[in-house]
Interface confidence: medium
């Protein structure tokens, strides 16, 4: 079975002038997951990004996040890069606190 | 081995367009973002623009916004810049480099060897 | 926009001796996520640029180990411990902070 998931992209203020913006994909199936910040449409360097364990969310399913620090302004140059089961997505940095995409495939 | 070819360059009239394109090979060149600088004869180098791997990001000096068009083709390994109202400051060499800013060697590690737009009258 | 300024403009260099160019900028290059996006390049005569150092300290591929680059949020340093003649050429730092990305004006290696 596959089960797509549900991405889920925050915002919080880390200190003066940054924030730090954190993806998170829940609900799916298999394990198997590719989830990264871009800048500028380019995946980030591994040392830019903190990244969650894939555990199990009690339902059969995953879920699992990553998160990077970015200047307040430069919201706009970075989207969060989902790949899951030869699907893949992207998600922006809500100009609010929260946003939530479903996939749909 | 990384080559960059440009071509497209020449003389061309104020007012004039030209179009370069940069060949691409020894490199999976959908992978990459890349950018165009060029250099004025006995000058310093300028950033042009800059285009994402899927193309998705563009971004331009304001000295050629709104005149240079940057695309690329990833089937051809191709990145192109077409230049509208040219100017005589924008005689250059123009040069395409890879943009690996997250990769390796990081920014701009590969450059072509450039080809010469004259703009005169 | 970021303002690039370096010095010395030209630097003579006798072989074997060290040289350093410095390079500023107008506002820090210290990204949140403590990367530093300063970059230096050098062009040969009548060739293309080639990367030597890339977020500010880190030696770039094939570059020898003579090089190296350290400094701040807005003041660069660029060192070559034991000038070769093969080292002539001008020298440019660039930020890679924020669009639009801007060089230094260059500073230009010369052999005694």
């Known amino acids: 079975r596959r089960v797509p998931p549900m991405v889920n992209v925050t915002r919080s203020e880390a200190s003066e002038g940054n924030i730090t913006v954190t993806c998170r994909a829940s609900s799916f199936y298999p394990r198997n997951i590719t989830l990264t910040w871009r800048q500028d449409g380019v995946s980030l360097s591994h040392d830019t990004q903190q990244w969650g364990d894939v555990l199990p969310d009690g339902n059969g399913t995953y879920q699992t996040w990553v998160a990077t620090r970015i200047c307040q302004g430069e919201e706009q140059r970075f989207t969060c890069y989902m790949e899951h089961s030869g699907n893949h997505s992207t998600h922006p940095v809500p100009s609010g606190k929260v946003l939530v995409l479903q996939s749909h495939w | 081995q990384v080559q960059l070819v440009e071509s497209g360059g020449g003389l061309v009239k104020p007012g004039g367009s030209l179009r370069l394109s940069c060949a691409a090979s020894?490199?999976?060149?959908?992978?990459?973002?890349m950018s165009w600088i060029r250099q004025a004869p006995g000058k310093g180098l300028e950033w042009v623009s800059y285009?994402?791997?899927?193309?998705?990001?563009?971004y331009y000096a304001d000295s050629v916004k709104g005149r240079f068009t940057i695309s690329r083709d990833n089937a051809k390994n191709s990145l192109y810049l077409q230049m509208n109202s040219l100017r005589a400051e924008d005689t250059a060499v123009y040069y395409c480099t890879t943009d690996r800013r997250h990769y390796g060697s990081y920014a701009m590690d590969y450059w072509g060897q450039g080809t010469l737009v004259t703009v005169s009258s | 926009d970021i303002v690039m300024t370096q010095s010395p403009l030209s630097l003579p260099v006798t072989p074997g001796e060290p040289a350093s160019i410095s390079c500023r900028s107008s506002?820090?290059?210290?990204?949140?996520?403590?990367?530093?996006?300063l970059y230096w390049f050098l062009q040969k005569p009548g060739q293309s640029p080639q990367i030597l150092i890339y977020?500010?300290?880190n030696l770039a591929s094939g570059v020898p180990d003579r090089f190296s680059g350290s400094g701040s949020g807005t003041a660069f340093t660029l060192k070559i411990s034991r000038v070769e003649a093969e080292d002539v050429g001008v020298y440019y730092c660039?930020?890679?902070?924020?669009?639009?990305?801007?060089f230094g004006p260059g500073t230009k290696l010369e052999i005694k």
């Open positions: 285009i994402s791997p899927g193309g998705d990001y563009i």
């Open positions: 506002k820090s290059l210290l990204h949140s996520n403590l990367n530093t996006y």
């Open positions: 020894g490199f999976t060149f959908s992978n990459y973002a």
């Open positions: 977020r500010m300290s």
């Open positions: 660039m930020q890679h902070l924020e669009y639009p990305f801007t």
